[in-house]
């Protein structure tokens, strides 16, 4: 039994780091493998993660962490029984993938303005809470070419757009994702999408 693709890990900078790797053949990850992780710190405890299958030869492990600070560094040991398959390290602050925003809502009752709001996925005491910026994706269910991205570079989790920038009388969907420049994070996953019917009063044309 050998590791084909070494574990790569990302942290949500809150409580979970996710490590993925591939074995050289079909593996029952949960029964055959264990990923041990330990904070590099005096008297820290070793913790065990039981991996799950992620495709035939792929494994994924969700490492539970009380919280994360920038100084954290973990040693990682992948074991198959008594055999050490791989040894590495992981610094969560250097591999951050933020949590996805939630509760995306489209408010259509503000004159001819669409107000999109969502929730910051972090509690106020988390460092990322005040460092997230967002991308909002809006697309038409009827027209695949009608696909747009709005970058929200301010901290407030909301976006206002004129309803008239979208076509009237058709359904649209929206989703949002987040990233944090301070830690050069990857983008989060997209939030679940929300759907609304876009309609607005066309202005009378003057002839």
């Amino acid at each position: 039994m050998k590791v084909l693709q070494e574990p790569t890990c990302v942290s949500d900078y809150m409580s979970i780091s996710t490590c993925e790797w591939k074995m050289n053949g079909p593996t029952n990850c949960s029964t055959e493998l264990r990923l041990l992780y330990q904070l590099v710190f005096l008297l820290s405890e070793a913790h065990t993660c039981i991996p799950e299958n992620n495709g035939g030869a792929g494994c994924v492990c969700h490492l539970l962490m009380d919280d994360v600070v920038s100084a954290d560094n973990y040693t990682l040991d992948l074991w198959a029984g008594q055999q050490l398959l791989w040894k590495g390290s992981f610094k969560p602050s250097e591999h951050v993938k933020p949590r996805a925003p939630g509760n995306l809502t489209v408010h259509t009752n503000v004159s001819d303005t669409l107000l999109l709001t969502w929730s910051n996925p972090y509690p106020p005491d988390n460092y990322l809470y005040n460092h997230l910026t967002y991308a909002v994706n809006i697309w038409s269910e009827n027209d695949p070419a009608d696909f747009r991205i709005y970058n929200v570079t301010y901290l407030e989790p909301s976006l206002r757009i004129a309803a008239s920038t979208l076509k009237s009388g058709i359904s649209y969907r929206a989703r949002v994702r987040a990233w944090a420049q301070c830690y050069n994070t990857t983008w989060s996953e997209w939030s679940p999408s929300t759907k609304w019917h876009n309609s607005y009063r066309e202005p009378f044309e003057q002839h």
Epitope: L39, F41, L42, L43, S44, E45, D66, V69, A71, D72
Partner: antibody
């Protein structure tokens, strides 16, 4: 809710023995290292001893080494401190405290008072 | 062992004032930790890894420093902040505490 409850304190004569217990609840006891910390009346805090989650690593302060023995029973969610050859200067409130990986004590018991006096 | 010396021993201030507590180590430490203790109660973790606030600690508290000199600052004292504060090091065994700084109402 995480709880640590110490017991076993009391009055003992110099040279005598006492066994303190710490009952843990509200968390997976076997995942954490636990410490004893004491505080003499009106004085500051003094770290006494540490035991790793699996009992594989144990440390003592020099002031108690050779006289105190720390142990734990993960099946009973319990921590112990066997104190022998007690001295007047061991008089203190003894706290058990849960250790965190980043090096601090995040939960403490309410303490149990040990008085060494003739 | 690493000896931690806190100053001042007592700090007499009024609510709303700024409090600065110092902790000096006899040799360099990686991080400093702070605990708050009120009469008849067990200590509570207050600041960890020099500058991180423990859960539930108000933002008026901050920690700073490196090497041998560390500081706990309370930007504007509230009535519930009057207590004894201990610094502690986790760099080497035995773990040691400072003797404490009592923040009392003037």
């Amino acid at each position: 809710e995480v709880q640590l409850v110490e017991s076993g304190g009391g009055l003992v004569q110099p040279g005598g023995s006492l066994r303190l217990s710490c009952a843990a609840s509200g968390f997976t006891f076997s995942d954490y290292g636990i410490h004893w910390v004491r505080q003499a009346p009106g004085k500051g805090l003094e770290w006494v001893s540490y035991i790793r989650s699996d009992s594989s690593i144990i440390h003592y302060a020099d002031t108690v080494k050779g006289r105190f023995t720390i142990s734990r029973d993960n099946a009973k969610n319990s921590l112990y401190l066997q104190m022998n050859s007690l001295r007047a200067e061991d008089t203190a409130v003894y706290y058990c405290a849960r250790g965190r990986d980043r090096g601090y004590f995040d939960y403490w018991g309410q303490g149990t008072l040990v008085t060494v006096s003739s | 062992e690493i000896v931690l010396t806190q100053s001042p021993a007592t700090l007499s201030l009024s609510p709303g004032e700024r409090a600065t507590l110092s902790c000096s180590a006899s040799s360099s430490v990686s991080y400093m930790y702070w605990y708050q203790q009120k009469p008849g109660q067990a200590p509570r973790p207050w600041i960890y890894l020099t500058s991180n606030l423990a859960s539930g600690v108000p933002a008026r508290f901050s920690g700073s420093g490196s090497g041998t000199d560390f500081t706990l600052t309370i930007s504007s004292l509230e009535p519930e902040d009057f207590a004894v504060y201990y610094c502690q090091q986790w760099t080497s065994i035995p773990f040691t505490f400072g003797q404490g700084t009592k923040v009392e109402i003037k």
